[in-house]
Interface confidence: low
Amino acid sequence: SERCDDWGLDTMRQIQVFEDEPARIKCPLFEHFLKFNYSTAHSAGLTLIWYWTRQDRDLEEPINFRLPENRISKEKDVLWFRPTLLNDTGNYTCMLRNTTYCSKVAFPLEVVQKDSCFNSPMKLPVHKLYIEYGIQRITCPNVDGYFPSSVKPTITWYMGCYKIQNFNNVIPEGMNLSFLIALISNNGNYTCVVTYPENGRTFHLTRTLTVKVVGSPKNAVPPVIHSPNDHVVYEKEPGEELLIPCTVYFSFLMDSRNEVWWTIDGKKPDDITIDVTINESISHSRTEDETRTQILSIKKVTSEDLKRSYVCHARSAKGEVAKAAKVKQKVPAPRYTVELACGFGAT
């Protein structure tokens, strides 16, 4: 067969859909690989062809678009299942071609089962709500394009297994779920079930997402360095191990990159000849505030090392801070027993 630009199996787009529900899957070629859209391709005389490989098989097969009630159909660049079945799981390929051009990509589709409480192997999107921030909303995701705007679906919201009605601070408003004041107790999985009619049939769309209540930007502060501080002096004798922890608290900030680093005499440890190691640990609070600890360690410190400047730095979207550790050389205690003994003429 003639050459075809094969983009391979696009595992970045691992598509999961629920069994016995409608699913609409766009050919990824136009979204991520080609610089033109389906309409342009169609106008240029290119044809979109679909085929698939069943789970645990190597054989590529055409998709059967002649099933009863048009269970599987194609519309423009979308492959429709009305509804899905478990054995629809497999790798699907969409190929765009004419006599002189060919491009194709495959993607995995997994049809998953859910139980009566909406538990399933589905990977859930996480929606973060700010704690005690005023009214915030989540929206039932990925339901666009399933029904025309003239169709008014019914939407039922659940928290875990429970239908949301008469909850104190959570109110269903159609496609939206409003949290009047988000609290830690609102953490959990929320499911919207969208029911709509089509050609005399009733379809259900189930969408579950995880709500995580996080620190509010109203309470966010620049990084706080707890250690090193002015109260602790790292007093060492040459040859001893020097351990200095840098412990920094970061308020939760959406999409903020939290950084901690040490400088020694103004240089990064990598740029200096000392044998220094740095170990980092990270912990999080319930609202995803972060505490990072970086321990600077010099196994056998020299008197030169004890004269250097050790500074802990921290940066977040809220600002940058730095704190120097107080490091000094321990003055050896006088060895009185020997000196006094010598003074009295002992041998």
Epitope: I135, N168, S178, L180, I181
Partner: antibody, heavy 117, light 110 residues
Framework: QVQLQESGPGLVKPSETLSLTCTVS????????WNWIRQPPVKGLEWIGY???????NYNPSLKSRVTMSVDTSKNQFSLKLSSVTAADTAVYYC???????????WGQGTLVTVSS | QSVLTQPPSASGTPGQRVTISCSGS????????VNWYQLLPGTAPKLLIY???QRPSGVPDRFSGSKSGTSASLAISGLQSEDEADYYC???????????FGGGTKLTVL
């Protein structure tokens, strides 16, 4: 139909504490934020603060040191106390519900409180 | 001195269109939604516009709201004598961690 009604003394002496109560009828104090807003004579509206059913509060920073709000879920009421009042605290005091859209969608009729000896 | 700035007065003749502006900053209007309230003499304030431009049920479509950057405006078309009232804009202020109002605009129907 949710309705709000303010009640309390219309006259308070300087340096004393102003106390008002808002009764919620036709609905519950559970959920929503319950706010106090005031309007001094020939001046604009000023937000005093809010309370929720669990007792969580947020006060106007300029009044914070003098304001205390409380809620009584059994009576479906919430209250405002403003200490050390002066003539500048003379105003029509409104209670209002902060609804689903971050807006005061239901208001009480307002009660005029005069601070005078 | 109000955090949000409104013109103290506005006027128009019946049938005309009037616009009331509300100017703020990045910590209030710039990052939060704007609401508008109508205060008719002797009655409780009434929510006129929420979430920048949404009208609660019962508010005539003659009232419309808009927001751009750190400013918002309320437009009243087909002005009627019963529209004579005080109008206030309001928004949450992230810096003050509280609700702020404009100074109010007195609308006179000539």
């Amino acid at each position: 139909q949710v309705q709000l009604q303010e009640s309390g003394p219309g006259l308070v002496k300087p340096s004393e504490t102003l106390s008002l109560t808002c009764t919620v009828s036709g609905g519950s104090v559970f959920s929503y934020f319950w706010n106090w807003i005031r309007q001094p004579p020939v001046k604009g509206l000023e937000w005093i603060g809010y309370i929720d059913h669990s007792g969580g509060t947020n006060y106007n920073p300029s009044l914070k040191s003098r304001v205390t709000m409380s809620v009584d879920t059994s009576k479906n009421q919430f209250s405002l106390k403003l200490s050390s009042v002066t003539a500048a605290d003379t105003a029509v005091y409104y209670c209002a519900r902060e609804g689903l859209h971050d807006a005061f969608d239901i208001w009480g009729q307002g009660t005029l409180v005069t601070v005078s000896s | 001195q109000s955090v949000l700035t409104q013109p103290p007065s506005a006027s128009g003749t019946p049938g005309q269109r009037v616009t009331i502006s509300c100017s703020g900053s990045s910590s209030n209007i710039g990052s939060n939604t704007v609401n508008w309230y109508q205060l008719l003499p002797g009655t409780a304030p009434k929510l006129l516009i929420y979430s920048n431009y949404q009208r609660p049920s019962g508010v005539p479509d003659r009232f419309s709201g808009s927001k751009s950057g750190t400013s918002a405006s309320l437009a009243i078309s087909g002005l009627q004598s019963e529209d004579e009232a005080d109008y206030y804009c309001a928004a949450w202020d992230d810096s003050l961690n509280g609700r702020v109002f404009g100074g109010g605009t007195k609308l006179t129907v000539l």
